[in-house]
Every structure is written in C-alpha cells, then in structure tokens.
Interface confidence: medium
C-alpha cells in the first residue's frame, strides 16, 4: 500500500521567540528515500529541514530517526520569528539512483501563526 504522510495539526500558534513542534508521521519507511520539510508550495517553497544529516539552525528532529522503524518525523523550531510564519509541509521522497529524488507523498500542511510577544 502507498505510504501515507500525516500532519494532524491544521495550524499552530506560537509567540515570537518561543519554540513550536510541527508533527508528522508516516505509515511506512518504504520506498527508500528521505523525508523533508518545506514552507510554502510551488516555485516559492523553501526547504526547512531534511532528515539526511545536514545542519539546520534552530530546527531539530523531535524523535530519534536513527532508531529502526521510527515513523515520527516531527520537528521543533526554536526561537521563532515572524518570518517563520507560513504553511509547512512534510514530504516523503523516493531516492533516485542517478536521477533526482522523486516526491511521492505530502502531508496536508500545518499553518504556523507567529504572535507578537
């Protein structure tokens, strides 16, 4: 069966300077390939976090994704700023051998509202 990506929260509100968790789980780790978080859609979408080992300032994974059968790809964004406002998507990719990774499934999106402190 096709992998399913779920973001249960439609929206989260966070005060500037605080941290927030964006939840995402998948039903399967197959096909092999990374999970990435983006803000926005289409041409303007911005890579926020990738579960592939790179360093992303202010963003950490919530659970230990090195553990076998971990299906939780939630992230924590710390020291939130007004520029962090927007809709975040958790996206599953299938790894390409020579060609680029292929996007196969996206969560429904979670809108982040940033409140003035």
């Amino acid at each position: 069966t096709e992998v399913k990506v779920t973001q249960p929260e439609k929206s989260v509100s966070v005060a500037a300077g605080d941290s927030t968790i964006l939840n995402c789980t998948v039903t399967s780790l197959l096909p092999v390939g990374p999970i990435r978080w983006y803000r926005g859609v289409g041409q303007s979408r911005l890579l926020i976090y990738s579960f592939t080992g790179e360093h992303f300032p202010r963003i950490r994974n919530v659970s230990d994704t090195t553990k076998r059968n971990n299906m939780d790809f939630s992230i924590r964004i710390s020291n939130v700023t007004p520029e962090d406002a927007g809709t975040y998507y958790c996206v599953k990719f299938q790894r390409g051998s020579s060609e680029p990774d292929t996007e196969i499934q996206s969560g429904g999106g979670t809108e982040v509202y940033v409140l003035a402190k």
Epitope: T6, P8, E9, K10, V12, T25, T27
Partner: antibody, heavy 119, light 108 residues
Framework: EVQLVESGGGVVQPGRSLRLSCAAS????????VNWVRQAPGKGLEWVSL????????YYADSVKGRFTISRDNSKNTLYLQMNSLRAEDTAVYYC????????????WGQGTLVTVSS | EIVLTQSPGTLSLSPGERATLTCRAS??????LAWYQQKPGQAPRLLIY???SRATGIPDRFSGSGSGTEFTLTISSLQSEDFAVYYC??????????FGGGTKVEIK
C-alpha cells in the same frame, strides 16, 4: 454565542436534488473549516464533507462523491450542500458542524435538518 | 480509512454507577480522539478532545484516557442526564473523518 442553523430539508423523490443551507453566527465564519455530518434514522454519525475557511480545500466521503457539492459564501456567513441524484440511503438528519481551529474535531453543531428520500 | 469500534453497543446501568466505554482504532491515532454525547432529538455535543481534555463546561465526572489504538470514556457516577449515546471520533487521519458506531448508555 456560536449558532449554526440548518435549513432546506424535506421530502424528495429518488434521483431529484435538494440544497441545504447552514446560517452561522457568533464567530468569524471565514476563519473556520466547516463540515456536513449526517445521521440516518436510528443509526450512527457519518461524516459527509468538509470545506476550509477560504473554500479552497474540499473533501467528500466516498458515498457522496460526484453527487454532492459543498460550498460557502463567507459574505453571507452561510454553508451549503447541493445534493443531486439523491438515493434512499441519503435519508438522514444533516448537521453542519464547525471545526476546532487547530484540529479536525467539532466544537459546535447545528440542530440538524431532516432529508427524506422516498418515492 | 481508520475504523473505530466502540464497545459495548449498549450499557445498562443505574444512576450513581460508574460507566466505562471503550473505543478501539484500527491503527494508531496517537491521542487525536474526541468523544461526543448525543441525546434523542438533539445534536451531538463535544465532551472530550485530545483523548483526555474536557471541553468547556463539561463536568469532571466525565474523563477520557488512552492513546494509540485503545481509548476509554469513563463517567464516574451516572446522573439522570447522562443516559444518552456516546460516539468517538478520530481526527488524526486526513479526511475521511471517522466516527465509532456509538455506545448507548441506558437506565437499568
């Protein structure tokens, strides 16, 4: 105080159409996703359809897909359900239900309107 | 689609007794589960969300517990106004949103 008032129910023959309305008040209608949920006589609750606050995101239950159309007019604070090709199994009380602003559970419900499909 | 199974179908109890209602999910819904109460001729009313948080105005004799696939709604001491049908609903999965089949709590 949140109020949701459904109207438009009645008796209709199989294959015919009906349009339900839900008038909302007491909250900023355009900021909330709203749903139709139905209940056949003596049966449980069945989710029918959902529309986002802006109207851009729409979902339907498989049982009504292609026959029912959900819409909203935020300038009139009103939710609609256009029901075509009605069947006997569509007979139910239809409730409009306002979602929580963060999760897809239902904070507030209307009193319901009865749709009876019968020849 | 996530299937919710409620048990028992009917619970016959006397006022003052404790009621324990169960809702099982076909796959994990974490704590994304709500409970509603419905009385005859009325719309459902939200009781519990997040598996254990009481909605505004709900008396503390109502409590929810559980996570994953097994959930419980407990009414510690039944009052006359508590005899009704109770439904669980998961909101973890993207639509279709699903409800359990309901448990009727009736006077013994």
């Amino acid at each position: 105080e949140v109020q949701l008032v459904e109207s438009g129910g009645g008796v209709v023959q199989p294959g015919r159409s009906l349009r339900l309305s839900c008038a909302a008040s007491g909250f900023t209608f355009s900021s909330y996703d709203v749903n139709w949920v139905r209940q056949a006589p003596g049966k449980g609750l069945e989710w029918v359809s959902l529309i986002s606050g802006s109207g851009e995101i729409i979902y339907y239950a498989d049982s009504v897909k292609g026959r029912f159309t959900i819409s909203r007019d935020n300038s009139k604070n009103t939710l609609y359900l256009q029901m075509n090709s009605l069947r006997a199994e569509d007979t139910a009380v239809y409730y409009c239900a306002k979602e929580n602003n963060r999760y897809r559970f239902f904070d507030d419900w209307g009193q319901g309107t009865l749709v009876t499909v019968s020849s | 689609e996530i299937v919710l199974t409620q048990s028992p179908g009917t619970l016959s109890l006397s006022p003052g007794e404790r009621a324990t209602l169960t809702c099982r999910a076909s796959q994990s819904v974490y704590t994304y589960l709500a409970w509603y109460q419905q009385k005859p001729g009325q719309a459902p009313r939200l009781l519990i969300y997040g598996a254990s948080s009481r909605a505004t105005g709900i008396p503390d004799r109502f409590s929810g517990s559980g996570s994953g696939t097994e959930f419980t709604l407990t009414i510690s001491s039944l009052q006359s106004e508590d005899f009704a049908v109770y439904y669980c609903q998961q909101y973890y999965d993207r639509p279709p949103l699903t409800f359990g089949g309901g448990t009727k709590v009736e006077i013994k």
